[in-house]
């Protein structure tokens, strides 16, 4: 059975084809080759002789037991080699010779028992080494690591490491890898020798499900003393053994580390007193809790020095009380409990993401809701009912505003966005908005992107609501049940490049409303009910137009519409997916491609 | 279509069939078997995925006695620092995991419950597997 040609001459997918040897009928130009789940079993010298251009090679689950010297010799362009799930028993010293450009080596679940005997010391270009899910017992980083000066990611998770000694990291003292991220999760750790991490700098350290008791956790974290880490991730996994007890003593040792960003990811334990618990983390710049349950929500008003707070997928009794002077970014997403938003006091806040919480807002939005006048980014998407009762007073700095899939009330009662002259991006898609007021977008003089799909208009008519949006480049009006539009609806949009009118109820096409759109490149009218043209004579679309989508409409392929059908043929170079432009009527032509029709109409005598 | 039996409990019988053409082997055990009136137990899964499990989610299509409920999307793996350790599993890596579950106080009417589970993962998104579970429910007291 042949391999699947994904990208001709470049990418070949040969997964699970029962190959016992490397295929010899693929082009020399192949760059990406997936041979996973084939019983190759043995890789001899120059196994990839005929693949001089190879860049990505996937050999996952190929039952490989032996890799000989020079198996990958001549793969000088290879950047990624994946060996996941191979029961390697014999790995020659020169197994990886010739891989002079290798950046990523994945040897997950390959029976690797030690880093010491892993023959990769010459792979100077290596950036990522993943040896997770193996049998490694010692964390001693061999001397050859001093050659791996480009290493950025080392994944040792799910191994058998129990202890870390001062000598294990000696090589890092010799050549500090300032950018190294290290994942040691799911190793059954019970001892970290104090001083082992002294004066070590890491970009990221991840320790999840490493400790089987509070005491072990406490002493191991104390063993990290002296570590300087940009990002520290602690926590557990839902489907692994969890700590029975967790209290403030667990994290006391963190006072002896220098941490820029901290994250606690999943804890099967109720956090009550977070002030005491995170006492050593009051001055980290970024603080993050993922999938934890927080009892006392008042604690977030303590004088923490965080600049970025992230609360994701957590459980709260009620919306937390947030009073944090220095906070610039708040990400509060996919949380449960506390369905009503309550005011926060965050005077330095510039970025606020409150999406996907099912929150309801009694009044939105003004400076008093968020306690800041510095807000530039506000995401309230995928929430509940949001009642617009103020037009963003004090929030004039906003540049990005997203309400999609929330239920907006009172949108058509006044110019909600009047003060947002700096706004560049607005998404009110699927917000149950019914446009009944022409001044709805007044004030948005800088707006470049407007997404309002899935809403509705009074009498299904698009009026002149965009008159002030002179900088608009992208407009999405799809799924708005529109049947008609004002001939001057788009007259002021001379910068518009993309216009999506798909999934509406237009029965005819008219070029007139688009005459002023001098920058228009994409016009999508797919999934309407277009049968014919509005006027007998259709003019040309703007000369800038490059893509016109008229697919899945109800074209009437009859003589009376001959000029319209001819006009469509004349636009051929603009049309996309022409094979999906089919006749709907008459019945004998139903399903026929419009462009292949040859309508010869004669006057009936 | 071959039917794979999972378990029987006092009020339910659970089995599944594959609804994709690949039918990559997956082993599912529930201990103790689910009782629809109230249940607490462990779900054990042994599986070798054909693609990375990063950004795994399920599309659930549930039918209750021929009545179709709306499609439900359950995100399991968001893509970084996920709740489940198997979210970091790579294509070809053995997934051998036990997940605890519990629910109580749900009253199910007698009948046949079908649940099609479409597992989607990776970037670009592709189907990982598709299983159709059938739960025959015979409540002893309802």
């Amino acid at each position: 059975e042949p391999c699947v040609e994904v990208v001709p001459n470049i990418t070949y997918q040969c997964m699970e084809l029962n190959f016992y040897k490397i295929p010899d009928n693929l082009p020399f130009s192949t760059k990406n080759l997936d041979l996973s789940f084939n019983p190759l079993r043995h890789l001899g010298s120059y196994s990839f002789f005929s693949f001089p251009e190879l860049q990505v090679l996937d050999l996952s689950r190929c039952e490989i037991q032996t890799i000989e010297d020079g198996a990958y010799q001549s793969l000088s362009h290879l950047s990624t080699l994946i060996l996941t799930g191979n029961p390697i028993q014999s790995l020659a010293l020169g197994a990886f010779s010739g891989l002079s450009s290798l950046q990523k080596l994945v040897a997950v679940e390959t029976n690797l028992a030690s880093l010491e005997n892993f023959p990769i010391g010459h792979l100077k270009t290596l950036k990522e080494l993943n040896v997770a899910h193996n049998l490694i017992q010692s964390f001693k980083l061999p001397e050859y690591f001093s050659n791996l000066t480009n290493l950025e990611h080392l994944d040792l998770s799910s191994n058998k490491i129990q202890s870390i000694y001062c000598t294990d990291l000696r090589v890092l003292h010799q050549m500090p890898l300032l950018n190294l991220s290290l994942d040691l999760s799911l190793n059954p750790m019970n001892f970290i020798q104090p001083g082992a991490f002294k004066e070590i700098r890491l970009h990221k350290l991840t320790l999840r499900n490493n400790f089987d008791s509070l005491n072990v956790m406490k002493t191991c974290i104390q063993g990290l003393a002296g570590l300087e880490v940009h990002r520290l991730v602690l926590g557990e996994f839902r489907n692994e053994g969890n700590l029975e007890k967790f209290d403030k003593s667990a994290l006391e040792g963190l006072c002896n580390l220098t941490i820029e960003e901290f994250r606690l990811a999943y804890l099967d334990y109720y956090l009550d007193d977070i002030i005491d618990l995170f006492n050593c983390l009051t001055n980290v710049s970024s603080f993050s809790l993922v999938s934890v349950t927080i009892e006392r929500v008042k604690d977030f008003s303590y004088n923490f020095g965080w600049q970025h707070l992230e609360l994701v997928n957590c459980k709260f009794g009620q919306f937390p009380t947030l009073k944090l002077k220095s906070l610039k970014r708040l990400t509060f997403t996919s949380n449960k409990g506390g369905n009503a938003f309550s005011e926060v006091d965050l005077p330095s806040l510039e970025f606020l993401d409150l999406s996907r919480n099912g929150l309801s807002f009694k009044g939105c939005c003004s400076q008093s809701d968020f306690g800041t006048t510095s807000l530039k980014y506000l995401d309230l998407s995928f929430n509940g009912v949001i009642t617009m009762s103020s037009n963003f007073l004090g929030l004039e700095q906003l540049e990005h505003l997203d309400f999609q899939h929330s239920n907006l009330k009172q949108m058509s009662e006044f110019s909600v966005f009047l003060s947002l002259r700096n706004l560049i991006y607005l998404d009110i898609s699927h917000t149950h908005t019914r446009v009944a007021f022409n001044g709805i977008f007044n004030g948005l003089s800088s707006l470049e992107v407007l997404k309002m799909a899935g809403n509705s208009f009074q009498e299904n008519f698009l009026p002149d609501i965009f008159t002030e949006l002179r900088n608009l480049t992208f407009l999405d009006l799809s799924q708005c049940q529109l049947e008609q539009l004002s001939p001057t609806a788009f007259n002021s949009l001379s910068s518009l490049q993309v216009l999506n009118m798909s999934h509406n109820n237009f029965f005819s096409l008219d070029t007139f409303p688009y005459k002023c759109l001098n920058s228009l490149q994409v016009l999508d009218y797919s999934l309407n009910h277009i049968m014919t043209s509005k006027k007998q004579e259709l003019q040309h679309f703007p000369s800038s137009l490059a893509f016109l989508n008229l697919t899945q409409n109800d074209f009437a392929c009859t003589c009376e519409h001959q000029s319209f059908l001819q006009w469509i043929k004349d636009q051929r170079q603009l049309l996309v997916e022409v094979e999906r432009m089919e006749c709907a009527t008459p019945s004998d032509k139903q399903g026929m491609p419009v462009l292949s029709l040859n309508i010869t109409c004669q006057m009936n005598k | 279509q071959k039917q794979y039996w999972v378990c029987n409990s006092s009020d339910a019988s659970i089995s599944y069939t594959y609804c994709d053409k690949m039918q990559y082997p997956i082993s599912i055990n529930v201990n103790p078997c689910i009782e629809l009136k109230r249940s607490k137990g462990l779900l054990h899964i042994f599986y070798i995925p054909r693609r990375d499990l990063k950004q795994l989610y399920f599309n659930l299509y549930i039918t209750v006695n021929t009545m179709n409920l709306p499609k439900r999307k359950e995100v399991i793996c968001r893509g970084s620092d996920d709740d489940y350790s198997f979210c970091r599993a790579l294509k070809g890596e053995t997934v051998n995991t036990t997940i605890s579950f519990s629910f109580k106080g749900i009253k199910f009417s007698k009948g046949k419950y079908k649940c099609v589970v479409e597992a989607i993962s990776g970037s670009p998104e592709e189907m990982l597997f598709c299983l159709e579970f059938v739960i025959l429910h015979q409540p002893n007291s309802n």
Epitope: K21, I22, D24, N25, P27, F28, G44, S45, Y46, S47, F49, S50 | -
Partner: nanobody
Framework: EVQLVESGGGLVQPGGSLRLSCAAS????????MGWFRQAPGKEREHAAL????????YYADSVKGRFTISRDNAKNTVYLQMNSLKPEDTAVYYC??????????WGQGTQVTVSS
């Protein structure tokens, strides 16, 4: 078993030309691809050019593209490498290699090419 014998190497001035030959004998029916590799002092062995017997498709490394030409003579069971516009950096031992249908790779003994003024 496949035997390969190279010839045609030598000393040449920059800008000059050489033609290398590789005569194959033995189980030549089993050969899928043949090619020329080169190894400069202190460097890894690298592809220069490849030719596929079945369909005649050809590959050249970027460093030799436009200057080297690989060809074959079926009647003589020989593969050639015509090298024009030679540069000092082309100095290396040039090896002929053949890959069989069983993925086994056979090598010649190598021929020295020196480009120097």
């Amino acid at each position: 078993e496949v035997q390969l014998v190279e010839s045609g190497g030598g000393l040449v001035q920059p800008g000059g030309s050489l033609r290398l030959s590789c005569a194959a004998s033995g189980s030549i029916f089993s050969i899928n691809d043949m090619g020329w590799f080169r190894q400069a002092p202190g460097k890894e062995r690298e592809h220069a050019a490849l030719i596929r017997f079945k369909d005649g498709s050809i590959y050249y490394a970027d460093s030799v593209k436009g200057r080297f030409t690989i060809s074959r003579d079926n009647a003589k069971n020989t593969v050639y490498l015509q090298m024009n516009s030679l540069k000092p950096e082309d100095t290396a031992v040039y090896y002929c290699a053949a890959k069989t249908g069983t993925s086994f790779v056979y090598w010649g003994q190598g021929t020295q090419v020196t480009v120097s003024s």
